[in-house]
């Protein structure tokens, strides 16, 4: 309500995330992610739970496939409303390759820099969403260690959709995505049966991210 007692349209976060966090979401945008609007719906549900601002939580988004695109930087938007609008407009960039190590490494080296809005002394969180084994998995171990060395907390989400569509074994894929997650794995790793099911993990994921502030 405004000072003149008029209703002001605003989005109140479902659960306030008022302590500072710098969160970079790393999205697999390869063709096999289908349908894409399941990803944007997931983003919407997750982001609306956050209290976003220059002195609160900041969010940046990186999309990868064959190469990497910074969709927006940590300091690009200063409110939850602005971030929600921007996230809804993110288009799938496509490609057949899933360069997960490249995506994570780019997020670490570029998205989490002060030039892109990262704040000194603020906890760094990375959320990685992917649906397939990486084409650069020989690099993953080092890339994850580099994140570990920089105290970047990692939540990883394995979408099993393309495996289930092709009746393929998910074992190797799940192991890879588990290896990306911070310890303890059971608190940092999620898997969903398909893209449509992404929204079902938002509440738990949100709670676990907020728990990092304690």
């Amino acid at each position: 309500v405004s000072p003149t007692f008029q209703v002001v349209n605003s989005i109140a976060p479902v659960q306030e995330c008022s302590t500072q966090l710098d969160i970079v979401i790393v999205l697999d945008g390869s063709n096999s992610i289908y349908p894409w609007d399941s990803v944007t719906a997931f983003l919407n549900d997750l982001l609306k739970r956050m209290d976003i601002g220059p002195k609160q939580t900041q969010v940046g988004i990186v999309q990868y496939g064959e190469n990497v695109t910074h969709e927006f930087n940590l300091n690009k938007y200063s409110s939850t409303e602005e971030v929600l609008v921007a996230a809804k407009k993110i288009v799938q960039r496509g490609g057949r390759q899933t360069m997960t190590a490249l995506g994570i490494d780019t997020a670490r080296k570029e998205a989490f820099t002060e030039a892109r809005g990262a704040r000194r002394g603020v906890k760094k969180v990375m959320v990685i969403v992917t649906d397939g084994e990486s084409h650069d998995n020989h690099r993953l171990k080092k890339v994850i260690q580099d994140c570990e060395d920089e105290n970047i907390q990692r939540f990883s989400i394995a979408i099993l959709g393309s495996y289930n569509r092709g009746n393929l074994s998910t074992e190797k894929f799940v192991e890879e995505i588990k290896s990306i997650a911070s310890e303890p794995t059971e608190k940092h790793f999620f898997n969903v049966s398909d893209e449509l099911a992404l929204v079902t993990i938002v509440k738990t994921l949100g709670e676990r991210i907020f728990a990092l502030e304690a």
């Epitope: 960039r93 569509r165 092709g166």
Partner: antibody
Framework: EVQLVQSGAEVKKPGESLRISCKGS????????IGWVRQMPGKGLEWMGI????????RYSPSFQGQVTISADKSISTAYLQWSSLKASDTAMYYC??????????????????WGQGTLVTVS | EIVLTQSPGTLSLSPGERATLSCRAS???????LAWYQQKPAQAPRLLIY???RRATGIPDRFSGSGSGTDFTLTISRLEPEDFAVYYC?????????FGQGTTVEIK
């Protein structure tokens, strides 16, 4: 803005060869599959085949396998549909369309979200 | 391959009326991978609905899709003059794409 622009109408004689084109713009053309769809006069839509311009991986509908060739030149963001010997029954409107989805590992799925304006091919 | 049968072949209605178009598959369509397209004379098809019920970008909310398994429906809640066209359903859950034969929605 995503656009698929097809080559102009063609009038050919039976036995002649033909190649029609579909040029994509406004998106990363090498990163999305492009499909071809036939519509014979007064009839419905038939899927012919699909190509990934990034590496020219191609899949055909069994009904069109061996009847047509689908190719692409990624350097100019263009997909092609060609015939080596046209028949009167090839008279139709041909559309290209971008696939929102994938066709990897033997499994294809997805919808066609953007379409070209169509190329009318008349064989008589 | 999955055969899609659309009914009715032709639907004669007046502007403002509700249109209900049916698409029946010869076997279950996996993951509800069914789309609907609209085609007007001398124009390319236009995507309306995908994954059975999701509206494509820019499609008015008078268009809605529903169904799963073998039975799918496209509903136009209130026909506008520009909605008179041919509508095709398409399945894409079997590593190939097949279309229904189309339903023509014409002005009564």
């Amino acid at each position: 803005e995503v656009q698929l622009v097809q080559s102009g109408a063609e009038v050919k004689k039976p036995g002649e060869s033909l190649r029609i084109s579909c040029k994509g713009s406004g998106y990363s053309v090498t990163s999305y599959w492009i499909g071809w769809v036939r519509q014979m006069p007064g009839k419905g839509l038939e899927w012919m085949g699909i190509i990934y311009p990034g590496d020219s991986d191609t899949r055909y509908s069994p009904s069109f396998q061996g009847q047509v060739t689908i190719s692409a030149d990624k350097s100019i963001s263009t997909a092609y549909l060609q015939w080596s010997s046209l028949k009167a029954s090839d008279t139709a409107m041909y559309y290209c369309a971008r696939l929102q989805g994938d066709c990897s590992g033997g499994t294809c799925y997805g919808h066609f979200d953007y379409w070209g304006q169509g190329t009318l091919v008349t064989v008589s | 391959e999955i055969v899609l049968t659309q009914s009715p072949g032709t639907l004669s209605l007046s502007p403002g009326e509700r249109a209900t178009l049916s698409c029946r598959a010869s076997q279950s369509v996996s993951s509800s991978y069914l789309a609907w397209y609209q085609q007007k004379p001398a124009q390319a098809p236009r995507l309306l609905i995908y994954v059975a019920s999701r509206r494509a970008t820019g499609i008015p909310d008078r268009f809605s899709g529903s169904g799963s398994g073998t039975d799918f429906t496209l509903t136009i809640s209130r026909l506008e003059p520009e909605d008179f066209a041919v509508y095709y359903c398409q399945q894409y859950g079997t590593s190939s794409w097949t279309f229904g034969q189309g339903t023509t929605v014409e002005i009564k």
